[in-house]
């Protein structure tokens, strides 16, 4: 469960991948499509606010509160619209909701390897996003194997202006 | 009660070789990420190694990279640091901490254990 | 590497004094930053994460602000128990790296 309502903390951020591939939202026919892209030197990194939660993992073999703490993060590239597993369907998309969030919209936040990050879904453990075809998508990933997986690693860049379309 | 001990710290020749352990207990240590830092006798404290929970990943300060090795056995509970040609610059007490987070090492350290003293010395 | 660069390195107090130690990155790590406080012969001890958290069972008196490059750690009204060496630590990337660390001694 999610240990408090409010985040402990937010940061505004440009999304890229592994290999510098900007993660852009783009309004098409009343809805937002994500994409993966190299940008064009001139064009501005679409910003996305991360917002960080602390949530305890199911069981406690302590039961004491030390045991088992994560680090989940929402994402929202502009206001009131939020990422959101869809597990059906193997894709990330974009809903726009109200709060409480969906538990679709709420990730496990791994770091890893060359200081990147990655995205596991509250929802479906196991399951990351990741990049498919120069979309975002779900992957699952054997823990034994991929972990450092390069499609499922992403970079966070800081953005200074704290202001949030 | 959650802790930490470590053992292993002597004294050395430069040169040589130790190997440092640390014993877990009150937490499922198999979740967690740890890490070993170390101060140096007047001076501040310094990062040296961490290892994620499986033991899959591991990190290294530029200092010690080629010359520390840090494992971990989940069924003993228990982190490891191996030492490698060690200088007087290794002097220092050596901590085993562990990460506020399973999976990320955004929230710092919030548990550690007493240290282990290593001393360098011809 | 980042670098974390603290200041003062020393600072002399009163209980019941407020004092305010500072913790610049050399590049920007969002909020992740970390405060420790460490006594002679004691471990180090979480007292602030995420930049602004207090860490469970510390006192209130411990406060810090901050984001990006600039942090502050905050004691509200000095107790004898809180001379000791304070740390910032930057949590956002490897090699983690701490501040040379602040000493706090009684005036």
């Known amino acids: 469960s999610i240990t408090g309502i409010s985040p402990i903390t937010e940061s505004l951020a440009s999304l890229s991948t592994y290999n510098d591939q900007s993660i852009t939202f783009a309004l098409e026919d009343e809805s937002y499509e994500i994409y993966v892209e190299d940008l064009k030197k001139d064009k501005k990194k679409d910003k996305v606010l991360l917002s960080y939660y602390e949530s305890q993992h199911p069981s406690s073999e302590s039961g004491d509160g030390v045991d088992g703490k994560m680090l989940m993060v929402t994402l929202s590239p502009t206001k009131d619209f939020w990422l959101q597993a869809n597990n059906k369907e193997h894709s990330v998309e974009l809903h726009k909701c109200e709060k409480p969030l969906p538990d679709q919209a709420f990730f496990v936040l791994h770091n890893r390897s060359f200081n990147c990050v990655s995205f596991e879904c509250k929802t479906d453990p196991g399951v990351f996003i990741g990049v498919k075809d120069n979309h975002l998508a779900l992957i699952k990933v054997d823990y034994s194997e991929n972990l450092g997986s390069e499609n499922i690693l992403f970079k966070l860049s800081e953005i200074h202006h704290h202001h949030h379309h | 009660e959650v802790q930490l001990v470590e053992s292993g710290g002597n004294l050395e020749q430069p040169g040589g070789s130790l190997r440092l352990s640390c014993t877990a207990s009150?937490?499922?240590?198999?979740?967690?990420?740890m890490n070993w830092v170390r101060r140096a006798p007047g001076k501040g404290l310094e990062w040296v190694s961490g290892?994620?929970?499986?033991?899959?990943?591991?990190y290294y300060a530029d200092s010690v990279k080629g010359r520390f090795t840090i494992s971990r056995d989940n069924s003993k509970n228990t982190l490891y640091l191996q030492m490698n040609s060690l200088s007087a610059e290794d002097t220092a007490a050596y901590y085993c901490a562990k990460d506020s987070y399973t999976t990320s090492w955004y929230g710092g350290m919030d548990v550690w254990g007493h240290g282990t003293t290593v001393t360098v010395s011809s | 590497d980042i670098q974390m660069t603290q200041s003062p390195s020393s600072v002399s107090a009163s209980v019941g004094d407020r004092v305010t130690i500072t913790c610049r990155a050399s590049q920007g790590i969002f909020s992740w930053l970390a405060w420790y406080q460490q006594k002679p012969g004691k471990a180090p001890k979480l007292l602030i994460y995420a930049a602004s958290s207090l860490q469970s069972g510390v006192p209130s008196r411990f406060s810090g602000s901050g984001s990006g490059t600039d942090f502050t750690l905050t004691i509200s009204s000095l107790q004898p128990e809180d001379f000791a060496i304070y740390y910032c630590?930057?949590?956002?990337?490897?090699?983690?790296?701490f501040g040379q660390g602040t000493r706090l001694e009684i005036k």
């Open positions: 290892i994620s929970g499986s033991g899959g990943r591991t």
């Open positions: 009150g937490f499922t240590f198999s979740r967690s990420a």
């Open positions: 630590q930057q949590a956002n990337s490897v090699p983690i790296t």
